[in-house]
């Protein structure tokens, strides 16, 4: 599995999407887990509704929510009030019995809020992530831009 990088701004919400084959994963509940290192175990954070037909209902665990569009084949995870400690490796999983298939590996990166002037000297404009040289980056920043404001982070 390639790793997809999702970048969010501290204090904002970050939405992570995990597309999948809706037919192949028909009837399966989904989960979002945090991986403890690149080879480490994956600790369950939140899973979809116990009744698969109700998977569209958003379920929360703390500041993390999960909802599943089982027809369209998209699992969506929302990390509310993103904090530095939310950074890390995660997986979207499809559950069957005691087994779990990985739908997508996700690296969440937390960027300093460019409007938080306490951090003005400590903004992170991310360069290459050496651990995932071929990783796909999703700039999933939910805050709408103010008039005349330069988008953050800059994209090449």
């Amino acid at each position: 599995h390639n790793t997809t990088v999702f970048q969010g701004v501290a204090g904002q919400s970050l939405q992570v999407s995990c597309p999948y084959d809706s037919m192949k994963h028909w009837g399966r509940r989904k989960a979002w887990c945090r991986q403890l290192g690149e080879k480490g175990p994956c600790q369950r954070v939140v899973s979809t509704h116990n009744l698969w037909l109700l998977s569209f209902l958003r379920r929360w665990n703390g500041s993390t929510a999960i909802t599943d569009d089982t027809l369209g084949g998209t699992l969506t995870i929302t990390l509310r009030n993103l904090q530095p400690h939310d950074a890390g490796l995660y997986q979207c999983q499809s559950l069957h019995g005691s087994e779990a298939d990985t739908l997508r590996k996700v690296l969440v990166e937390v960027l300093a809020d460019p409007l938080d002037h306490r951090d003005a000297g400590d903004l992170w404009f991310p360069g290459e992530s050496e651990s995932f040289e071929d990783a796909h980056v999703e700039h999933s920043i939910s805050r709408s831009l103010l008039e005349g404001e330069i988008p953050f982070p800059p994209t090449s």
Partner: antibody
Framework: EVQLQQSGAELVRSGASVKLSCTAS????????IHWVKQRPEQGLEWIGW????????KYAPKFQGKATMTADTSSNTAYLHLSSLTSEDTAVYYC?????????????WGQGTSVTVSS | DIQMNQSPSSLSASLGDTVTITCHAS??????LSWYQQKPGDHPKLLIY???NLHTGVPSRFSGSGSGTGFTLTISSLQPEDIATYYC?????????FGGGTKLEIK
């Protein structure tokens, strides 16, 4: 018991090479990354590189490229560090270290270290 | 390479004191910072991972904080067994790099 057992101290001549070993017990090295760390006498720690024993992938600190070669043998659950063209600068204790990689590994095992002394 | 600037390089404190060691990264490393303790003749031991998470078996008097480029290791109520050299290490990118170390001694 989970541990990393390193080979014994080495006294080697300048210009020669040496191969250090690190054998794991209580876990499979394939499930971990094996790092090597150098510590010169009364100095700090320097990261040499890591190897993924599962597939042989490795990454070196630029400073140790050409000096160090890391290998692993999963059948004997052992990782190796080969140091070539030794000079006095290579006199140090070399540690092997196993973890689950970047991004929040909670596993952290170290060998007892192997002392390498380079004599002229 | 990311440079890790650790300070002070040595410090002397009394038993029961609260001790603070800082580490500054030359680039943003998010929370990918570990703290190690090394006693003479022994291998380094992990104290803190991911900037603020206490490793298994480490006493709660050790704590870590920070993100971005500035990080702190705090030892509250210093004990005799805490006499050691402490190192920070970044795990944001390879090569991993260590700070220069802080040698902690008893006054």
């Amino acid at each position: 018991e989970v541990q990393l057992q390193q080979s014994g101290a080495e006294l080697v001549r300048s210009g020669a090479s040496v191969k250090l070993s690190c054998t794991a017990s209580g876990f499979s090295i394939e499930d971990f990354y094996i790092h090597w760390v150098k510590q010169r006498p009364e100095q700090g720690l320097e990261w040499i590189g890591w190897i993924d024993p599962e597939n042989g992938d490795s990454k070196y600190a630029p400073k140790f490229q050409g000096k160090a070669t890391m290998t692993a043998d999963t059948s004997s659950n052992t990782a190796y560090l080969h140091l070539s063209s030794l000079t006095s600068e290579d006199t140090a204790v070399y540690y092997c270290h196993a973890d689950h990689g970047n991004y929040g590994s909670t596993m952290d095992y170290w060998g007892q270290g192997t002392s390498v002394t380079v004599s002229s | 390479d990311i440079q890790m600037n650790q300070s002070p390089s040595s410090l002397s404190a009394s038993l029961g004191d609260t001790v603070t060691i800082t580490c500054h990264a030359s680039q943003h490393i998010n929370v990918w910072l570990s703290w190690y303790q090394q006693k003479p003749g022994d291998h380094p031991k992990l104290l803190i991972y991911k900037a603020s998470n206490l490793h298994t078996g480490v006493p709660s008097r050790f704590s870590g904080s920070g993100s971005g480029t500035g990080f702190t290791l705090t030892i509250s109520s210093l004990q005799p067994e805490d006499i050691a050299t402490y190192y920070c290490q970044q795990g944001q990118t390879y090569p991993r790099t260590f700070g220069g170390g802080t040698k902690l001694e008893i006054k």
